[in-house]
C-alpha cells in the first residue's frame, strides 16, 4: 500500500506483506551487494560474516506469539532495522568512489532501496494491525513506546570490524524476513469477506 494509506482488503494486504517479505529475504537485494561493495567477497572473509545470535527474534519465538503480538514485535524490530540501515548507509562509499574502483553502481542503488522498502513493509504491518482492530500499535512514523533500541554495533575504530558487523546484521535480517514470510504464508485465508 502507499505510505500513509491502508487497504481494507484483508487478502490484498496480506498478499502485499507476503510479497514484501518474499523480496526482503532475498540476499541478492541487500546482503550480496553489501558484501561486494565492502570488499568482503572473498571466501576467507565471507566465512566471518555469520549471524550474531539473539540479534533478531527467532522463528520459534515469533510462532509463539498471537497475530497481534507478532505484528507488534515485527513493528518494533523493523524500527530497529531502520536505525541500523541508516547507520550502515552513512558508511557506504559514494557513487563516484564506486565508479573509480570499478564496482557496480547498481549495488549501491539496491542498498539505498532497503530503507524505503522497510518503511513500506512497516506501513503495511501497521495497516494489518488496524485491520485486526489492534489499537495498541503505534503509527509507523512514530517511535513506539517500549520499542527496543536498535542493536548497537560494538564501539570500534576498526573499519574492517564494522564491515563484518554490518554483514552479520544483514545476514540476520534476511533470516528474520524468511521467518516472517513463513509465518505470513501460514496466516492463510481469513473468514471470507469477499461479498462486500
Amino acid at each position: 500500500a502507499a505510505m500513509g494509506s491502508c487497504s481494507k482488503e484483508y487478502r490484498m494486504l496480506l498478499g502485499q506483506l507476503q510479497k514484501q517479505t518474499d523480496l526482503m529475504q532475498d540476499t541478492s537485494r541487500l546482503l550480496d551487494p553489501y558484501i561486494r561493495i565492502q570488499g568482503l567477497d572473498i571466501p576467507k572473509l565471507r566465512e566471518h560474516c555469520r549471524e550474531s545470535p539473539g540479534a533478531f527474534p527467532s522463528e520459534e519465538t515469533l510462532r509463539g506469539l498471537g497475530r497481534r503480538g507478532f505484528l507488534q514485535t515485527l513493528n518494533a524490530t523493523l524500527g530497529c532495522v531502520l536505525h541500523r540501515l541508516a547507520d550502515l548507509e552513512q558508511h557506504l562509499p559514494k557513487a563516484q568512489d564506486l565508479e573509480r574502483s570499478g564496482l557496480n553502481i547498481e549495488d549501491l542503488e539496491k542498498l539505498q532501496m532497503a530503507r524505503p522498502n522497510v518503511l513500506g513493509l512497516r506501513n503495511n504491518v501497521y495497516c494489518m494491525a488496524q485491520l485486526l482492530d489492534n489499537s495498541d500499535m503505534t503509527e509507523p512514523t512514530k517511535a513506539g513506546r517500549g520499542t527496543p533500541q536498535p542493536p548497537t554495533p560494538t564501539p570500534t575504530s576498526d573499519v574492517f570490524q564494522r564491515k563484518l558487523e554490518g554483514c552479520s546484521f544483514l545476514r540476520g535480517y534476511h533470516r528474520f524476513m524468511h521467518s516472517v514470510g513463513r509465518i505470513f504464508s501460514k496466516w492463510g485465508e481469513s473468514p471470507n469477506r469477499s461479498r462486500r
Epitope: 500500500a1 502507499a2 505510505m3 494509506s5 487497504s7 481494507k8 482488503e9 487478502r11 490484498m12 496480506l14 498478499g15 502485499q16 507476503q18 510479497k19 514484501q20 518474499d22 523480496l23 513500506g120 505470513f184 504464508s185 492463510g188 485465508e189 481469513s190 471470507n192 469477499s194
Partner: antibody, heavy 120, light 106 residues
Framework: QVQLVESGGGVVQPGRSLRLSCAAS????????VHWVRQAPGKGLEWVAV???????DYNAAFMSRLTISKDNSKNTLYLQMNSLRAEDTAVYYC??????????????WGRGTLVTVSS | EIVLTQSPATLSLSPGERATLSCSGS?????MYWYQQKPGQAPRLLIE???NLASGIPARFSGSGSGTDYTLTISNLEPEDFAVYYC?????????FGQGTKLEIK
C-alpha cells in the same frame, strides 16, 4: 506443462445467464489462486474475480453482484457464473493463474480466452 | 481505485531502436507489473515486482520506477516485440491495468 483452457463462451441474449469453465493442467487449484480477467473488443484488460487455493473469493465490486466464481478441485476446473448479462459484458474472458500459493494478485500463466457476445 | 495512465498511447519505432513506455498511477503503488499482448493472443507476463524479469523473458526488457511513475524499457527492439503493453498494479483494491501502449513498426 502449466496450461489453462477456457470454454463456455458464445452468443447470449441480454438478461440471460452463462457459465464459463477453465480447465487447469500442470498444477493443482488447491495450491494456487486463479483469476478471471476480461477484455472488451479493442479495449484494455479488466480484473473480474479470483478464487484462492482454499476456496475464498474476491470480486471486482463493479459487477460482483452478477457473478459467482467457483471451482471443482477434483476436476481441477474453475467456473464463472454470469447472470443478468448486458451488452457491456461482451468481451474475451481469460482465466489466469497467480504465480505462487500466496495472495498474489498478478498473473504468470494465461489461457487463450473465450469470447462472450451479449446481443439480441 | 487506482487509475494507471500509460503513455504514449502509440509508439512508432524501428527494429534496433530503444523503446521507453511509461505508466503513471493516480496514487502511489508498491510494485508494478508489465504484460505484452499480441493480436489474437493472451497477455504474457514480462516484468514482476517493478524490475524482475519473468521466466523466459529476454534481457532486453527491463523495468524501473517507484511511487507513481514506472517505466518499461526495451533496449534493442526485435520484430517480435511490436505489440500492446499493459502495466498493472495490485497495491490497492481492485487490481487495475493501464489502458495499454501500442508499439508499432515505423
Amino acid at each position: 506443462q502449466v496450461q489453462l483452457v477456457e470454454s463456455g463462451g458464445g452468443v447470449v441474449q441480454p438478461g440471460r445467464s452463462l457459465r464459463l469453465s477453465c480447465a487447469a493442467s500442470g498444477f493443482s487449484l488447491t495450491n494456487y489462486g486463479v483469476h478471471w480477467v476480461r477484455q472488451a473488443p479493442g479495449k484494455g484488460l479488466e480484473w473480474v474475480a479470483v478464487i484462492w487455493r482454499g476456496g475464498s473469493t474476491d470480486y471486482n465490486a463493479a459487477f460482483m453482484s452478477r457473478l459467482t466464481i467457483s471451482k471443482d478441485n477434483s476436476k481441477n476446473t474453475l467456473y464463472l457464473q454470469m447472470n443478468s448479462l448486458r451488452a457491456e459484458d461482451t468481451a474475451v474472458y481469460y482465466c489466469a493463474k497467480s504465480p505462487n500459493s500466496n495472495f498474489y494478485w498478478y498473473f504468470d500463466v494465461w489461457g487463450r480466452g473465450t469470447l462472450v457476445t451479449v446481443s439480441s | 481505485e487506482i487509475v494507471l495512465t500509460q503513455s504514449p498511447a502509440t509508439l512508432s519505432l524501428s527494429p534496433g531502436e530503444r523503446a521507453t513506455l511509461s505508466c503513471s498511477g493516480s496514487s502511489s503503488v508498491s510494485y508494478m507489473y508489465w504484460y505484452q499482448q499480441k493480436p489474437g493472443q493472451a497477455p504474457r507476463l514480462l516484468i514482476e515486482d517493478t524490475s524482475n524479469l519473468a521466466s523466459g523473458i529476454p534481457a532486453r526488457f527491463s523495468g524501473s520506477g517507484s511511487g507513481t511513475d514506472y517505466t518499461l524499457t526495451i533496449s534493442n527492439l526485435e520484430p517480435e516485440d511490436f505489440a500492446v503493453y499493459y502495466c498493472q498494479q495490485w497495491s490497492s483494491y481492485p487490481p487495475t491495468f493501464g489502458q495499454g501502449t501500442k508499439l508499432e513498426i515505423k
